[in-house]
């Protein structure tokens, strides 16, 4: 959690940001909240990025003011205009690019004062894995696939029955570059699978951690997946 306070003659106001991660090619949110004001026309929101000359986004007098917006953000940003009055200065960033990573500043001016807070924004690719029985294999095999990851993640298998076992000798992981030449498809195969067990395929890079679980019994297969963004620290 980054909490910033204002300086200068006016009173300072509290601004809070949360470090987050963007999935390249998708839309992302840069989170920022502040002490709300009664009048929308008195609120100014400025988003800046370290190393970028122009503004990322500016909102003042109840509407976007994009005359000083940097070219790299043109047509890609928006605030939640109806939520500004309640203290939400979060920025929606469309079509996240790898180059959008960096340090952002959320700078707020209201009738109560000024304040700002920095936000670390990471970019990469992450997706939910799906674990299935490999119906083309010549033995009891599971196949874990996730369509988009970047940077290259690690893949670790685990099982409920053999807790703490190292499956690296009985698994094989490959990374296949996707057509846009940045993200990669992750495929991991686990051999010597036993019935009446739950297996987990865990994919992790410095941005996200995703797990695909599969419970195999002789009569059915049950699957579950979840994804967690790492370093989502509030500031």
């Amino acid at each position: 959690l980054i909490i910033g306070f204002g300086i200068s003659g006016r009173h300072s106001i509290t601004v809070t940001t949360v470090a987050s991660a963007g999935n390249i090619g998708e839309d992302g949110i840069l989170s920022c909240t502040f002490e709300p004001d009664i009048k929308l026309s008195d609120i100014v929101i400025q988003w800046l990025k370290e190393g970028v000359l122009g503004l990322v986004h500016e909102f003042k007098e109840g509407k976007d003011e994009l005359s000083e917006q940097d070219e790299m953000f043109r047509g890609r940003t928006a605030v939640f205009a109806d939520q500004v009055i309640v203290g939400n200065a979060s920025l929606r960033l469309k079509n996240v690019q790898l180059t959008d990573a960096g340090t952002y500043k959320c700078y707020i001016i209201t009738s109560k004062g000024k304040g700002n807070a920095n936000l670390e924004y990471k970019t990469g690719a992450f997706s939910m894995p799906e674990v299935n029985v490999d119906y083309n294999a010549s033995s009891e095999t599971l196949r874990c696939e996730a369509p988009r990851w970047f940077p290259q993640p690690t893949v670790v298998w685990a099982s409920q029955v053999d807790q703490g076992a190292n499956f690296s000798e009985v698994s094989n992981t490959s990374f296949e570059l996707n057509s846009e030449n940045v993200t990669m498809k992750v495929v991991s195969v686990l051999y010597n699978v036993t019935i009446n067990n739950t297996y987990s395929c865990m994919i992790e890079n410095d941005i996200a951690k995703a797990t695909g679980d599969i419970k195999v019994t002789e009569s059915e297969i049950k699957r579950r997946s979840h994804l967690q963004l790492l370093n989502s620290k509030a500031s």
Epitope: S138, S139, E140, I195, V216, T217, E218, S219, E220, I221
Partner: antibody, heavy 118, light 106 residues
Amino acid sequence: DVLLQESGPGLVKASQSLSLTCSVTGYSITSGYFWNWIRQFPGNKLEWMGYISYDGGNSYNPSLKNRISITRDTSKNQFFLRMKSVTAEDTATYYCARKALWLRFDYWGQGTTLTVSS
Amino acid sequence: EIVLTQSPAIMSVYLGEKVTMTCSASLSVSYMHWYQQKSSTSPKLWIYDTSKVASGVPGRFSGSGSGNSYSLTISSMEAEDVATYYCFQGSGYPFTFGSGTKLEIK
């Protein structure tokens, strides 16, 4: 107990399509397991043809993949084998059977004999 | 595909004699299952998961093996054991059966 019962035309002409039905009692085909078709040729050779799983997924023997489809009617607790362009080589006894994942066929039907005439 | 080779193809044995038939897999499999088939009936599960005897199967039957090599044994042949026995692997796709061992009385 789980009972499987095959039914079919008995005799079909070469190049025609074939449809066989397996009616299951004593267990819902959507509750679990893998519901298979197996055939036994006149020389007694057994061949696994394919299955439909409890969740509707299919797996087929690659040697037959382009010629067969296995479907189901969950309301009647039945599953079906459809085969295109039959030839005399498809003359066999056709069995339906329940299979455990990676393991055995535990219940079989009594079989239905199919003769393909030219 | 995994090819299962059964031997011998035909066995002629005396009543009371010990019988061992084998099933060899072209690739290692985790489990082997055995089916008994008598003429004009469907195959019956006889031995499953390599060594477990199916319900209703006499105690004189046993199964063993691992990897590529499996066997079915009858400790003392009886007249009702006359049948064809098929091995089966359900681990690797496509699932495959052996060509069978036909058991007869001498």
